[in-house]
Amino acid sequence: HTVELNNMFGQIQSPGYPDSYPSDSEVTWNITVPDGFRIKLYFMHFNLESSYLCEYDYVKVETEDQVLATFCGRETTDTEQTPGQEVVLSPGSFMSITFRSDFSNEERFTGFDAHYMAVDVDECKEREDEELSCDHYCHNYIGGYYCSCRFGYILHTDNRTCRVECSDNLFTQRTGVITSPDFPNPYPKSSECLYTIELEEGFMVNLQFEDIFDIEDHPEVPCPYDYIKIKVGPKVLGPFCGEKAPEPISTQSHSVLILFHSDNSGENRGWRLSYRAAGNECPELQPPVHGKIEPSQAKYFFKDQVLVSCDTGYKVLKDNVEMDTFQIECLKDGTWSNKIPTCKIVDCRAPGELEHGLITFSTRNNLTTYKSEIKYSCQEPYYKMLNNNTGIYTCSAQGVWMNKVLGRSLPTCLPECGQPSRSLPSLVKRIIGGRNAEPGLFPWQALIVVEDTSRVPNDKWFGSGALLSASWILTAAHVLRSQRRDTTVIPVSKEHVTVYLGLHDVRDKSGAVNSSAARVVLHPDFNIQNYNHDIALVQLQEPVPLGPHVMPVCLPRLEPEGPAPHMLGLVAGWGISNPNVTVDEIISSGTRTLSDVLQYVKLPVVPHAECKTSYESRSGNYSVTENMFCAGYYEGGKDTCLGDSGGAFVIFDDLSQRWVVQGLVSWGGPEECGSKQVYGVYTKVSNYVDWVWEQMGLPQSVVEPQVER
């Protein structure tokens, strides 16, 4: 009879074991275990009748199609075999064991005691067949195995071979190299590769196989396993395989598809090809006169580009347009995209006008082309070139006039400062106690007229100022504040300010330059109570032309000490010239007591301590700060007065040989101007040099060297 066994392990014994087995008996045990296992059988006891080739009693172990062993007897002899310590392993998951005894037994035989168990098959070690083994990596586990692939590969649906994803390769460059995956290593199995070469219309793709060409083939059938096909439009070239590479292929197309197929077996190294774009040839090019073509080649093909440039000092001229370079291109029809342009000498054209300056041409015929030279100069003696620049400009290769120091920037003609067109006399008679100024003696002197129409009725007053540049007037802050609210500092509106320059006689303003104000800038810390920081600036609407009667005064160096005691300075103004006129008389007579002709006086600087003391001794809260200095005579008789406010107290600077504004007429009193021991108080300008430059928007270095020259 037959016994079916399906357990993973078990015991098999001869009938009647451990007693002797009966005669004429046959039992078959069929053992089945799961796939991925095999069966291991071994005997713990074996005692059967001996016979030649086990003809009488035996135990036979077999699979479906193969006898694995036949055992009988008690000991192994030449003709019979006992299992002993031997282990029988089934090749698969099935094993059949048959016990048979014949009709007679000469003795009592106890039979056998056998054990079986399912054991794991290590498929990774035992699979020799390429059709079944893993392509790259094999992983065994109890009862089975699985395959995996190297980086960049994908496991095929057969769960065994490794393929690559290579169906999305686009080539758009004009030249390139395409290879089978992993070249020159064996290409992957079970793969469908697609390579697209897509170039601009007008190009034609040429293919050339190189180096190794090794694709699995067949001796009789053309390329049944692995192959390359080349698709050009509707036409298909190939299949190609084997070890002989195809001849170079001229596709005559700008679009080519390369298909590469591999099956699930074989170890071949693959292929490599290079492709190159070919286009129509364009005619030979001649560079223009005074120019060159880059790159310089014997032949030019479709899409080649050349850059036409000119020698230094020449510009490319194309359709009357000047440019640095011009590019032309070889077209698909074999013609150039444009004619070669010409090279024209650079022309810097007429040089820019220099404000307050002149231009002279150094080159004959007033040429303005490359390497021509011009010279700028300033309108002497009223303007001087900043930083003593040479003023020489050369027409550069870029088409701009260039100076070695300033580059393409024009020079600056700065107003000469502190140099009256007529020299100031060294001796001046004792505004009060002053004398008439000759025209041009104080060319910086400005008359500032303010008409404040913001109040009803309108307020009108005037003061003086000093020209610092063609656009800026320096004055006292109190001149430019609204007069009707004595405790507040409200700047007058710029619309209410008129400035007269080059004025000599206030009755005759015809020869003077009058200008309105663009900006009124009071010092932010001006104190109405004690007149500290009594300094302000007026920016003129338009720069004034300089001349013998209109020239700036120089600013001092930054010196907290200010002018030294006893130094003599000059002040000019149209203020009250008669010391015997009282304020009441001024009020009643309107403006008739003002000087018609500009007056000036020479005054010594008073030691600071002496001036402070003279004001502290008075009743009233007078404060002579470090931002002020005093000038005048102990005995009185000469002084600045009402209407002179904001005017410049100038001192001749021996070092620079120029007149420098050291003070601004600020305040004095309470006694009448020119009284004994009533010194005039002046704003110390040297404390404000930085502030002045900052407001004027000029770096201090611009004018400093002129003063120190």
Epitope: W461, Q483, T488, V583, I587
Partner: antibody, heavy 113, light 112 residues
Amino acid sequence: QVQLVQSGAEVKKPGASVKVSCKASGYTFTGKWIEWVRQAPGQGLEWIGEILPGTGSTNYNEKFKGRATFTADSSTSTAYMELSSLRSEDTAVYYCLRSEDVWGQGTLVTVSS
Amino acid sequence: DIVMTQSPDSLAVSLGERATINCKSSQSLLQSRTRKNYLAWYQQKPGQPPKLLIYWASTRESGVPDRFSGSGSGTDFTLTISSLQAEDVAVYYCKQSYNIPTFGQGTKVEIK
């Protein structure tokens, strides 16, 4: 001719604010100062402050600093005075005037609980 | 602040007679730069806003009868009505605008 027309009378509770308007005509509004003056019933005149509409510059009587605010709308040629934290002693006729010469008709502000 | 003191507080004058009002300031109102005394005189009738009569201490506003005149400088100022008319009955105020403006306390003018 130059004219200043003020808004109508107001009754306010203590602690509230009042805003009086003054519409100018007949001259360039932005170029002249507008002053504000008040007069308590049966009393004299008291200067509050001023504004220059073109620039927004202001001056205040120290007594009203922080309580009075002046503004001006150039597009409508109107000046405004706002007085906050009102108390009963702020009851008065409030006048606007163009610098020194032309006065508005006055606005009576009554502060009462 | 500049204090303005008017005198007398009230004044009764016969029609056609001269009326004089004084105004004293606690500091000078003369602005040296403009050479002006910043003092104005106003007339206020009941229920009306004040009306400008004199500015800069002595300049008559246009349209003001010439019987009104102003004088003085520095700290002492005077308003004179040379021949009082019935329509001149009012309260008169002086105002300084040299500084943050202040008014005098007013002088009431009546007919005797």
